[in-house]
Interface confidence: low
């Protein structure tokens, strides 16, 4: 199985080969590179020295190799670089070219979701429900879940509602947001508002959106 | 010598599927993307997607998503392609091809199979 | 999508004279670009990779250039047997795809 590596958008991915190299072979008899699913390379050292003739014009400038640890680093990560790596090593002889060595692995490109915010579209009308909408940027994968939390002094509910979501053309990351029309509980206390995005690793939590209710005015009297 | 077999001619009625196969010799099969292009008459040549049958990813041209499947069979160095839904636009020349070597350059279509004709005819 | 347009669908010459066939990117695909000829009832066969080199074997009077979004495919001379369908190709970025192709009639 490959070697599963998670990496951030805009930073750096290590993509390792580990290769004991027990024979104690040096770098200027062997051919080194990295291709990716596609088989497209994205950086070859041939007999020591990097060379650039086979490597894709996408990952051109966007690696470095550090013949210590036998990693290759791709920078300024892009949501489309995740898949699969592979790190082949070959042995120059006279003969031809013999595989000696080969790794998988497996990148995962993650980003951030900004902290959720909570905006209200309408004013609260008599004290009965609030529109108000609920987003967060600039994210991937996309999200599981997101809702609302409304917390009055005695009770907790939660609103789920459902998400929309948008992915941009060029970086691929994912803007989410869900719009609520909040309606609220027969109580006179103050309430806080909280948005809550679930992602697989994490749960982002917006800050407190406070609202202070009036005394209720007592109902009209009924005329059957 | 690197080498690509593909089935023979094909004649299919509408709405049916038709699958083809294409077998590589004279090199590993796991170690090279294979793709898939149609050819039709007059029209040149369009990129339908490709496998690379080492862990059987695929990617497809958004065109052919859904119609197009691309599978391999790494017991017997084949690749295969089937196509879903046949109306006559599918009436073409369609060739499987091979990348080159990743470590003396990467040409993603330098060796090519014969073509399997396929007729879509009632 | 890139689109790769070629601007003659066929082109006529003699033997022995120099043609160009002209293709045009859509946007920017460096010199990700091939070139392939396609004799009658024949596979495509690749000639020109990385928008200037010539694959093994291809004789020298075929040659490529540019980069960008425009390219140019060259017969220095041309021979009976350069009969063909020529198409150039991006594999900057999926879908990859062709230019229309040029046929090269001899008269």
């Known amino acids: 199985a490959p070697l599963k590596i998670q990496a951030y958008f805009n930073e750096t991915a290590d993509l390792p080969c580990q290769f004991a190299n027990s024979q104690n072979q040096s770098l200027s008899e062997l051919v080194v590179f990295w291709q990716d699913q596609e088989n497209l390379v994205l950086n070859e050292v041939y007999l020591g020295k990097e060379k650039f003739d086979s490597v894709h014009s996408k990952y051109m400038g966007r690696t470095s190799f550090d013949s210590d640890s036998w990693t290759l680093r791709l920078h300024n990560l892009q949501i489309k670089d995740k898949g699969l790596y592979q790190c082949i090593i070959h042995h120059k002889k006279p003969t031809g070219m013999i595989r000696i060595h080969q790794m998988n692995s497996e990148l995962s490109v993650l980003a951030n979701f900004s902290q959720p915010e909570i905006v209200p579209i309408s004013n609260i009308t008599e004290n009965v429900y609030i529109n108000l909408t609920c987003s967060s940027i600039h994210g991937y994968p996309e999200p599981k879940k997101m809702s609302v939390l409304l917390r009055t002094k005695n009770s907790t509910i939660e609103y789920d509602g459902v998400m929309q979501k948008s992915q941009d053309n060029v970086t691929e990351l994912y803007d989410v947001s869900i719009s609520l029309s909040v309606s609220f509980p027969d109580v006179t206390s103050n309430m806080t508002i909280f948005c809550i995005l679930e992602t697989d690793k994490t749960r982002l939590l917006s800050s407190p959106f406070s609202i202070e209710l009036e005394d209720p005015q007592p109902p009209p009297d009924h005329i059957p | 010598e690197v080498q690509l077999q593909q089935s023979g001619p094909e004649l299919v009625k509408p709405g049916t599927s038709v699958k083809m196969s294409c077998k590589a010799s004279g090199y590993t099969f796991t170690s090279y993307v294979i793709h898939w292009v149609k050819e039709k008459p007059g029209q040149g040549l369009e990129w339908i997607g490709y496998?690379?049958?080492?862990?059987?990813?695929?990617k497809y041209n958004e065109k052919f998503k859904g119609r197009a499947t691309l599978t391999s069979d790494k017991s017997s160095s084949t690749a295969y392609m089937e196509l879903s839904s046949l109306t006559s636009e599918d009436s073409a020349v369609y060739y499987c091809?091979?990348?080159?070597?990743?470590?003396?350059?990467?040409?993603?279509?330098?060796?090519w199979g014969q073509g399997t004709l396929v007729t879509v005819s009632a | 999508d890139i689109v790769m347009s070629q601007s003659h669908k066929f082109m006529s010459t003699s033997v022995g004279d120099r043609v160009s066939i002209a293709c045009k990117a859509s946007q920017d695909v460096s010199t990700e670009v091939v070139w392939f000829q396609q004799k009658p009832g024949q596979s495509p066969k690749l000639l020109i990779y990385s928008a200037s080199y010539r694959y093994t074997g291809v004789p020298d009077r075929f040659t490529g250039s540019g980069s960008g979004t425009d390219f140019t495919f060259t017969i220095s001379s041309v021979q009976a047997e350069d009969l063909a369908v020529y198409y150039c190709?991006?594999?900057?970025?999926?879908?990859?795809?062709f230019g229309g192709g040029t046929k090269l009639e001899i008269k």
């Open positions: 091809s091979r990348q080159g070597d990743p470590y003396s350059g990467n040409y993603q279509f330098t060796y």
């Open positions: 190709q991006q594999h900057y970025s999926t879908p990859y795809t």
């Open positions: 496998i690379n049958p080492y862990h059987d990813v695929t």
